[in-house]
Amino acid sequence: VPEKSVRWCAVSEHEATKCQSFRDHMKSVLPSNGPSVACVKKASHLDCIRAIAANEADAVTLDAGLVYDAYLAPNNLKPVVAEFYGSKEDPQTFYYAVAVVKKDSDFQMNQLRGRKSCHTGLGRSAGWNIPIGLLYCDLPEPRKPLEKAVANFFSGSCVPCADGTDFPQLCQLCPGCGCSTLNQYFSYSGAFKCLKDGAGDVAFVKHSTIFENLANKADRDQYELLCLDNTRKSVDEYKDCHLARVPSHTVVARSVGGKEDLIWELLNQAQEHFGKDKSKEFQLFSSPHGKDLLFKDSAHGFLKVPPRMDAKMYLGYEYITAIRNLREGTCPEAPTDECKPVKWCALSHHERLKCDEWSVNSAGKIECESAETTEDCIAKIMNGEADAMSLDGGFVYIAGMCGLVPVLAENYNTPNPNCENTAEEGYFAVAVVKSSSDLTWDNLKGKKSCHTAVGRTAGWNIPMGLLYSKINHCRFDEFFSEGCAPGSEKNSSLCKLCMGPSPNLCEPNNKEGYYGYTGAFRCLVEKGDVAFVKHQTVPQNTGGKNPDAWAKNLKEEDYELLCLDGSRKSVQEPANCHLARAPNHAVVARKDKADCVQTLLLDQQRMFGSSVTDCSSNFCLFESKTKDLLFRDDTVCLAKLHDRNTYEKYLGEEYVKAVTNLRKCSTSPLLEACTF
């Protein structure tokens, strides 16, 4: 059956031979209606990439550099399956490119000019492409030929395989730049030895190199890693201090109609039958015909790449930046230490309009990027298409797991002028019901629920976390008879109450009328039995404070809070009747942009913050007629975080633990991708 056939692309006679053997052996173990292998031979990996894009083949395994080529238009391929190394219990699908230095030296990443450098080899990922790609815009002009620019940047180097005649400085630390192990400073161990011997000041290697060469922790403690934010960390903190995370070897397919489920079914079956130590007659991860045919010999198996993970996310911002710099050879005109405009991520067209107005008022210091969901915005910030946005705590958690950092907190209670330097404790997550109902926390089963959105703090993580510990399962759509929880599966009962309009029904953005705090409260007013919101929601939308037709006649006394002890209290008593304390919303950004974002936002709020009194004829950053666009409308200021500058420290141990527990019930494709 052609649609059940995976056409594997082979790039040599030896690979084609192994592919045919793979095909024949898979035929013998798979049912006739299962996936099958067909072999397509091409002259090179680039030809394979083009063949897959043109639907003449379906899959090929590529190194990271080629995954980048495969992702570029017009190829538009995506990673679907990753090889892993090490054990099944602790599978490694990535390695980290790092810059290692001796602890007793005193320079940072931005002070490498004039130092002596040790590289694994010319054109190699960790030893050359990544460090030189990231340093590219700091190299002296002209930057071509690249070797000459690098020779003029460092005061001396060992770059195995470089041309010692044309670029003698690149071979200063290893005369001749030998391209094999005859050169004592060749490859990973060699580059590290170059540093260890004192020949060089910095070695560009992979994270495992130090551990492979220094078994003794005391010896390893004599070295540190240089981080991109111009700090240093110990060698075992490579996950938080690296130049780039590099995927090892990856199967790619078309982004649309790419047969990724079929490819996974095939490879999963293949590793069961012909993986490490599985079969004598055919081995997936070795071959009598040559080394690394179709797959790496060192691979131990395959892992399915999460569907939300596109090539940009898979390769990572740093890796793509490095490779793009090298390939395109373009650098910004502005010096790299100058803050470029900050690209704010706006959700759907409502936020985009407010962002546009901000952009005009900021004279272009703010630019705008749009996405349809918060998770899409976070992904855009990760890959550099956007720089920052303000997020509810639940999404601060996801953003943190995806490598972003909190930059400033929204403050709601502290009056100026102390606001900017005050760390507030947070707001209360509450359950609101109509005063006329007889509901309590203990009899919510079968009732109609209203949520701000799936994954948000007050609307989801806190109430559903509490509910989970009571019911011990994730079928929340069965607990409530129906509800509106934007971001739920469209056919779920938790989308039934949503108002839309269609096609935006149940979408987690302002196009869905019941989205957010105000939306969830509106859902309660019009259709629901209980709304999970922040403690300020009822006062902010009653007594004529919200002029919209549905809200203008509402009275605060017609609503009450549910307390966890089964009692109810007035909406004026959230301190004594709440579900939990929630961390304030916070602005997040990539680490490399955090300082810029903070500086610019503090400047912007001085001009457009809560000191502006007339928002009808002036732009106000924290105002959008109860719609909480870009920021919560009740924000007084954006406040510095001081030492709460990681998502764990910002959210607090208790909240992180609660959300981590709820991950069993996670419907977040982004979180799945970021924890791959």
Epitope: E357, S616, S617
Partner: nanobody
Framework: QVKLEESGGGLVQPGGSLTLSCAAS????????MAWYRQAPGKQRELVAG???????NYAGSVKGRFTISRDNAKNTVYLQMNSLKPEDTAVYYC???????????WGQGTQVTVSS
């Protein structure tokens, strides 16, 4: 509520110029930001240029150096002077004053600009 009406569109050759006007009924003196947007067939509506009451302006990268936004508060009008027009500038152009605070429908009829030889 302020009512806005766009005019001045038309057919123009590549390299040519046009000036769009947006007249407000009601006083635009109380309005802070005015902006021109455009929407090409099958594309999202995008910000072209904006101007604040104090005269701060901002332009989309694709029109910088070719388009100029200005406003005349006495005439309750905002203008978009478009020079060196390109085929990719073809779109319906709308003006807005943001007074509806972003979430009600704020678009008038717009004015069609077609750049073609």
């Amino acid at each position: 509520q302020v009512k806005l009406e766009e005019s001045g569109g038309g057919l123009v050759q590549p390299g040519g110029s046009l000036t769009l006007s947006c007249a407000a009924s009601g006083s635009i003196f109380s309005i802070n930001t005015m902006a021109w947007y455009r929407q090409a067939p099958g594309k999202q509506r995008e910000l072209v240029a904006g101007i604040t009451r104090s005269g701060t302006t901002n332009y989309a990268g694709s029109v910088k150096g070719r388009f100029t936004i200005s406003r005349d508060n006495a005439k309750n009008t905002v203008y978009l002077q478009m020079n060196s027009l390109k085929p990719e500038d073809t779109a319906v152009y709308y003006c807005t004053d943001y007074s509806r605070k972003y979430y009600e429908d704020q678009w008038g009829q717009g004015t069609q600009v077609t750049v073609s030889s």
